[in-house]
């Protein structure tokens, strides 16, 4: 590909006050935005969309609604109890013509295990998806349908980062023109063939994902075919050449010393904001050692924090992060020993991440306790283990078969965990609630949009 190729989708990312409340600081929120964008950037860059390669993402602008904005009448996301469709609509009612896509990140528990919602792109004649411009719709409102939303909460629990990253990639996949995967070729996780099944489903699977199977962060051939057609037709409308960092997006990118946003956002005494002249913007002010925008080991007084200060909390699988006294970045935390229990004894630590099932501690692998006749539905939200590659030995941790390891104690999945072979999520009552993949779409059909738009929104 030539350097002049338009392959970068510029994003506008907003976060609501609930997302801020969960993560606690602007810096932590920006770190979340950054990790989500990096994750989808890696997925899309490494996918060959029928000859279209190196599709990348860049944050053009962010807006962080803090808890102080909860009562601000100009903040459209201030309402506490909004359904997922309304939440997407609030995003779509803003004008997002300057962006390829505009997303809102939240920490809301939407109904029925919904983790995100987005408008689906199409090669022609459709409203929605990448590069879509604001226009008037039949309900009399102007809308930008180059939009989506994601939440980090499901049935009262917070989803692991890898799941949230895949949710983001999934919703953006809709914007890029991919419907949900269907058919045996593109839903291998539903296969009866154990070899195929163990690699899991692809990004655009309609229901649940654990995020740790081989296919979980890849696009299926079905998705690639659909996305390729949309990219072919639409990317010249708003994609840009990759290259320069964007001063003002709050993220310190290559070529920038710091980035505290634009003048209306910058609360930083250490960094020149993005409205400053070219030679100064996103540079440290004279005599300042660092900027909090560079990382949590910089004080508001623009000096590196001392050696003993904590910059990251202890987690299930990693010890607390401690500043080293000579950088603003928080050094990597030491991992806790492999096979340490985590996520309330349902998983184990592997290389500092809560990644493996508790079954792995005993040389077993996790499985779904489900009988084809539906008799054992009460066990769908138990952690169940089987001998490697032997589904006939799948039994609950509370069963006599595994009592040598679990002493007859039933370990239940955390609320929000995938269950019943990724068909649903466990709720707080330990019932496996099937995901109705097209529920919000069905509800929107009864709402304000004209019939030709019905097919262009998806979870």
């Amino acid at each position: 590909t030539t350097s002049a190729e338009k392959n970068t989708c510029q994003l506008y990312i907003q976060t609501d006050h609930l997302f801020f409340k969960y993560y606690g600081t602007r810096e932590a929120v920006i770190a979340q935005i950054s990790s989500h964008v990096k994750a989808i950037d890696t997925i899309y860059q490494t996918t060959d969309f029928s000859g279209i390669r190196n599709i990348s993402f860049m944050v053009k602008r962010i807006r962080i609604n803090t808890t102080a904005d909860e009562k601000d009448p100009t903040n459209p996301f201030r309402f506490p109890n909004i359904g997922v469709e309304k939440f997407l609509e609030l995003n779509s009612e803003q004008n997002h013509d300057d962006y390829c896509l505009a997303y809102v990140f939240t920490d809301r528990d939407f109904d029925d295990g919904v983790l995100g919602l987005a408008w689906v792109g199409a090669p022609s004649g459709s409203s929605g998806g990448i590069c879509e411009k604001s226009k008037l719709y039949s309900d009399g409102k102007k809308k930008s349908l180059n939009t989506g939303i994601i939440t980090v909460q499901n049935y009262g629990s917070h989803v692991p980062p890898k799941v949230s990253h895949i949710t983001f990639a999934h919703e953006v996949g809709h914007n890029f023109g991919s419907p949900h995967d269907s058919g045996t070729e593109c839903t291998p996780g539903e296969s009866k063939n154990l070899g195929q099944k163990e690699n899991g489903n692809y990004i655009m699977y309609a229901r649940a994902t654990s995020g740790d199977k081989l296919n979980n962060n890849k696009f299926s051939l079905c998705s690639i075919r659909n996305i390729s057609q949309v990219l072919e037709k639409k990317r010249n409308n708003c994609f840009v050449e990759s290259g320069q960092p964007i001063c003002g997006n709050g993220m310190v990118e290559q070529g920038e010393e710091c980035d505290c946003g634009y003048s209306d956002q910058c609360k930083d005494e250490c960094c020149f904001d993005a409205n400053q002249p070219e030679g100064r913007k996103c540079k440290l002010k004279p005599g300042k050692q660092c900027s909090p925008s560079q990382g949590p080991c910089c004080t508001a007084q623009c000096a590196f924090k001392s050696k003993s200060e904590k910059c990251r909390d202890d987690s299930d699988c990693a010890r607390e992060g401690i500043c080293n006294g000579f950088t603003a970045l928080c050094p990597a935390s030491d991992p806790k020993p492999n096979f340490t229990d985590c996520n309330r004894h349902t998983q184990v630590c592997i290389n500092g991440q809560c990644a493996g099932s508790i079954c792995e501690k005993y040389g077993l692998e996790e499985c779904t306790c489900a009988s084809s006749d539906g008799k054992d539905d009460k066990e769908l939200c138990h952690v169940c283990c089987m001998k490697k590659m032997d589904p006939s030995t799948c039994a609950s941790t509370g069963s006599v078969q595994w009592s040598r390891h679990f002493s007859g104690r039933t370990i239940t999945l955390q609320p929000g965990s995938p269950c019943n072979d990724f068909r649903g999520y466990c709720d707080v009552f330990m019932r496996c609630r099937l995901v109705d993949a097209d529920g919000p779409l069905a509800r929107l059909k009864k709402a304000i949009f004209s019939p030709e738009l019905y097919e262009n929104i998806a979870e």
């Epitope: 005993y362 009592s403 040598r404 390891h405």
Partner: nanobody, 123 residues
Amino acid sequence: EVQLVESGGGLVQAGGSLRLSCAASGFTFGDYAIGWFRQAPGKEREGVSCISISDSSTYYADSVKGRFTISSDNAKNTVYLQMNSLKPEDTAVYYCAADRLAYGLDPNFYDYWGQGTQVTVSS
């Protein structure tokens, strides 16, 4: 190589007793669970009793509770099944099986099996 050898079967009158032995070799005895299973002609293999060698915990099928006792002699790497008050319906080929991970009376969970010993209870 894992080997399990059953012995002690035979013909006995109803109400009588037998003691079956299962001699194990080729693995670390203390890491395993040993189960006794039986299969009558034309019927599926069913679990009778099992023992976890490391902690001596035991488990019995309802049909044999109070009549059969499982035990182990770790020095001899042998598990025993003492069968009292035998009934004609106890007639079957009796197998012992071993597994490093599992426990219980489901034969699917056991990796290693002996050849079996015949027990016949006449009325």
